[in-house]
Interface confidence: low
């Protein structure tokens, strides 16, 4: 018996087609992805093959203005239109709190939404009961397939799930659910979830009875043969893991942003054992036409976005200096504003010992592309912010050693004075540079804001300590020459859309007046650490 699994993950509100790098589509003949194009390909495969499942491994939420305006209603509407068979909850599905998941998505989706390792307690338990499930048995042709879901247990640090959801260890939570499916005589089981490729492989190895793992969160691109676009494969598709009980378990993921449709064919014997598996992600490029009816629907929903982008989010009573003359040479108040928004967006009081889990932000000055003039009645719109942050990036959470941060700050000024983008703007950090010293030895003071304290204060950076830092995905990936971040980071979790983070902060504050306040200083006398 042959099953075709079609899968997406980490789509991050790319409902419309995008450019090759998943930013705004400029030249339509070269654009990719989008739900209208995805639907064309899915329908083509459904017509050609008998047993097809369309699955999503989480993080549909968050990423473009679509999510900012529609808050998840767009996800339910278009996933329903594409007739998804199941979805696992990702960490970003909790970005607007549990209510922001229940109302627009869980109550509106016509397909099961799954996670076995999230347990509700207190008053939420009855409210959310039945709206998401640990597993679902789906009839496919003449057979049944069990799908068990899982979600990153780091979600409380990455999003806003509140205090009434407990995120358990994935493997511990999955095993009893798989065992339950076995007792129901379901012998073909897919684990569908959102914990990253390393956890996907562990699940394949450790959870007895799982036949296939379909994952997300780490935006992993797997491919067999010559890859069709810019993404470099992390391994073959499917990636085969030998389980502890000796079975060969295929593990798949399909990069991110709806650029590819994962396509996996599995052959099962009559006892539900996997005999063979093969496939590849399908690049959704312009050779695949956009479905006209879905496209028309997208255009109808688009109208509200255009209206939204010119509405006032809040006001500034000071000039927001995002000029390259400032942000690439010294502390600029636009950099301070953005970093303050990044920290504010990551407030998670998950431990009484810590006022927050993260206090530090770094931001390459070259990523700030425009100032905002306060003399337009102080109005700030989404459109204004899109000029400041035009690259469609995310503000991510990383863990770095102090020694890596020190290298990053040395890199920040290694060729100071040439208006280069690597000069860092900061939050929760006080840095002093001495430019009379040679490159690589210019940081004379680096103090960081404590997290394990009731009154936050600045302490000297410790080289061997591990720190959490919020930064643009561009820096996490080693951009602007910050190779040391990419090479030495200990953990990296993708965050929220950059513009959305700043717009939410401005809406919350209503009136802003960021100052230049001595976060970055220059000195010619020598300090000692």
């Amino acid at each position: 018996w042959e099953l075709t699994i079609l899968h997406t993950n980490d789509v991050h509100s790319r409902l419309e087609q995008t450019s090759e790098d998943s930013s705004k589509c400029v030249n339509a003949s070269r654009c990719m992805g989008g739900v209208a194009r995805l639907f064309t390909k899915v329908q083509q495969i459904r017509r050609a093959e008998p047993n097809v499942l369309l699955l999503d491994a989480g993080d549909q939420y968050q990423g473009t203005i679509w999510f900012t305006v529609y808050k998840g209603a767009e996800v339910a509407h278009f996933m329903n239109a594409l007739r998804y068979d199941a979805m696992a909850l990702g960490n970003h599905e909790f970005d607007n709190g549990v209510e922001g998941l229940i109302e627009p998505l869980l109550k509106e989706a016509k397909f099961p939404i799954l996670s076995a390792n999230i347990k509700a307690k207190g008053p939420l338990a009855s409210q959310i009961s039945g709206l998401y499930l640990p597993y679902k048995v789906l009839p496919v042709g003449d057979e049944v397939v069990g799908i068990v879901g899982y979600t990153s247990k780091e979600t409380p640090f990455l999003s806003n799930p509140g205090t009434n959801l407990v995120f358990e260890d994935e493997i511990t939570a999955l095993q009893p659910e798989v065992d339950k499916l076995k007792t129901l005589n379901v012998n073909k089981i897919i684990a569908l979830g959102h914990s990253g490729f390393e956890m996907d492989k562990l699940i394949a190895q450790k959870v007895r009875g799982v036949d296939v793992v379909v994952g997300g969160h780490s935006n992993t691109f797997l491919y067999t043969g010559n890859p069709p676009s810019k993404e470099v494969p992390a391994g073959k598709y499917p990636f085969i893991v030998t389980s502890d009980d000796g079975r060969k378990v295929p593990v798949v993921q399909a990069y991110a942003f709806g650029k590819y449709l994962g396509y996996l064919k599995i052959e099962f014997d009559e006892r539900g054992n996997v005999i063979s598996s093969h496939g590849n992600p399908i690049l959704l490029n312009s050779s695949i036409p956009e479905d006209p009816s879905i496209k028309a629907d997208i255009n109808k929903w688009r109208i509200k976005l255009d209206n939204y982008s010119t509405q006032e989010l809040g006001k500034t009573i000071v000039y927001l200096d995002g000029s390259s003359q400032s942000c690439r040479f010294r502390e600029c108040n636009m950099g301070n504003l953005i970093c303050d928004a990044m920290i504010n967006n990551n407030l998670r009081h998950t431990d009484e010992m810590f006022w927050n889990h993260v206090s530090m932000c770094i931001l390459n000055g070259g990523g700030i592309r425009s100032p905002i003039d306060e003399r337009n009645n102080g109005t700030i719109t989404w459109e204004n912010l899109a000029a400041v942050l035009p690259f469609g990036g995310t503000f991510d959470l990383v863990q770095l050693k102090g020694s890596t941060l020190k290298k990053a700050f040395e890199h920040s000024v290694h060729r100071y004075g040439q208006s280069t983008g690597e000069f860092l703007q900061v939050g929760g950090i006080h840095v002093v540079y001495d430019l009379s010293r040679k490159p690589g030895d210019r940081v004379v003071k680096l103090d960081v804001l404590c997290t394990k304290c009731r009154v936050p204060s600045y302490d000297p950076l410790k080289m061997d300590e591990v720190y959490k830092v919020i930064l643009p995905n561009f820096l996490a990936n080693g951009g602007d020459g910050f190779q040391m971040i990419k090479d030495e980071l200990l953990r990296h979790d993708s965050g929220d859309q950059d513009i959305n983070v700043v717009s939410t902060y401005i809406s919350k504050m209503k009136v802003i007046y960021p100052a230049v306040e001595g976060r970055i200083k220059f000195s010619h006398h020598h300090h000692h650490h």
Partner: nanobody, 113 residues
Framework: QVKLQESGGGRVQTGGSLRLSCAAS????????MYWYRQAPGEQRQLVAL???????YYVDSVKGRFTISRDDSKNTVYLQMNDLKPEDTAVYFC???????WGQGTQVTVSS
């Protein structure tokens, strides 16, 4: 296993040009910053130029305006176009992704006056 193969060196007169190539394997080339270094006899290896995954470039002052670094992600190759060569450019030239990887053999550039 990272493998780096430099080529294109040679002997030229002052004011001449060379184009160095470096073919890389075993790395996720398109998401990696690539560097050119050089080592003159009896001296430490020093950075010449780098190009990030987004195509941003950096040059040391001594080569600025004369050398151009570029990359072709489809070929997993980084190039160094060297114009207006001077005797002080004489060195073995190496490419690398992460400084700290094993080095390739390098390619010798000799500029005679």
């Amino acid at each position: 296993q990272v493998k780096l193969q430099e080529s294109g060196g040679g002997r030229v007169q002052t004011g001449g040009s060379l184009r160095l190539s470096c073919a890389a394997s075993g790395i996720s080339f398109s998401i990696t910053t690539m560097y050119w270094y050089r080592q003159a006899p009896g001296e430490q290896r020093q950075l010449v130029a780098l190009i990030t995954d987004r195509g941003n470039t950096y040059y040391v002052d001594s080569v600025k305006g004369r050398f151009t670094i570029s990359r072709d992600d489809s070929k997993n190759t980084v190039y160094l176009q060297m114009n207006d060569l001077k005797p002080e450019d004489t060195a073995v030239y190496f490419c690398n992704s992460i400084p700290g990887n094993d080095w390739g053999q390098g390619t010798q550039v000799t500029v005679s006056s």
